[in-house]
């Protein structure tokens, strides 16, 4: 069974998938469509790297641009380094500026909804 066939079989169960499953799925050449990606849990999407999302979506990755203001894409973009987002060539904006450190202060983040940034 190839990645696309596998994806069709599991598509309806993906809404509640944890990050670990999404990371594993990104290695399967599934080419997830944006409609499915937008239904994923935000907390499961946030830890994914740019490379993992690129692999997860395959050719559909360019669809991130159209959804850059919608959750969970918007919240995911805020967690990525702008340099990494730029590698996609989609014109995505809102990533963490170059030279900033991201402090994973879970309490601060829980209160504000955004990571804590320290300037250069």
């Amino acid at each position: 069974m190839n990645g696309s066939e596998y994806f069709v079989k599991i598509q309806s169960f993906l809404g509640g998938a944890p990050t670990e499953d999404l990371k594993a799925l990104s290695q399967q050449n599934v080419s997830m469509d944006l409609a499915t990606f937008m239904k994923l849990r935000t907390d499961a999407v946030l830890p994914l790297t740019v490379a993992e999302v690129q692999k997860l979506l395959g050719p559909h990755v360019e669809g991130l641009k159209a959804e850059e203001r919608h959750r969970p894409v918007r919240d995911w973009i805020l967690r990525q380094r702008q340099d990494d987002l730029d590698t996609l060539g989609l014109g995505l904006q809102g990533g963490i500026p170059n030279g900033y450190l991201v402090l994973d202060l879970s309490m601060q983040e829980a209160l504000s909804g955004t990571p804590c940034l320290l300037g250069p």
């Epitope: 469509d33 944006l34 409609a35 990606f37 937008m38 239904k39 559909h60 360019e62 669809g63 991130l64 641009k65 159209a66 959804e67 203001r69 919608h70 959750r71 989609l90 014109g91």
Partner: antibody, heavy 119, light 108 residues
Amino acid sequence: EVQLQQSGPELVKPGASVKIPCKASGYTFTDYNMDWVKQSHGKGLEWIGDINPNTDDTIYNQKFNGKATLTVDKSSSTAYMELRSLTSEDTAVYYCSRRLIGTGYFDVWGTGTTVTVSS
Amino acid sequence: QIVLTQSPAIMSASPGEKVTLTCSASSSVISTYLCWYRQKPGSSPELWIYSTSNLASGVPARFSGSGSGTSYSLTISSMEAEDAASYFCHQWSNYPYTFGGGTKLGMK
């Protein structure tokens, strides 16, 4: 056949509100965002905003913040746009249009609803 | 916001004539994020060309689209009566999404 059916023309008084329905049929409602566009003689086509039917997540053109409110009713595959505090500037044809999630173009447009604001 | 300026605003063409409509952006637009709509009088707009050069379903092959950066165009290789309509360009490269003012194309 994919269709976006909108209601007929509305004549409303200044200061009033109007809620325009857009009934979708012929496709999976939650696979497409619903965008709304204003067409007036003076300003041409203007994008108002959009809504994701899965999450009710909305994005508005800043110009229409406080003027338009977008909602959906998944059970009836209907999107709504409410316009409030209407003035003569709001006289226009309003279109709903579907946008495949992950694209930015509108591949099907609604029939359009003409809103005339006049005392 | 990105301003799209279409020219000419109004024009007419003879049957068989080659027609080119232009759309100029105030700042650069990624070509994937530029499309065109056609609108006949009294009707809703309809998607005509997407991602700069891809024809929407049912659009005749005499239509083509091209461009990059700030300059885009829609070309009709041989004008026909049914092509008389208004044509609007649209960008979704930046928020808010914007449209050009349109070109009203008539038949001579």
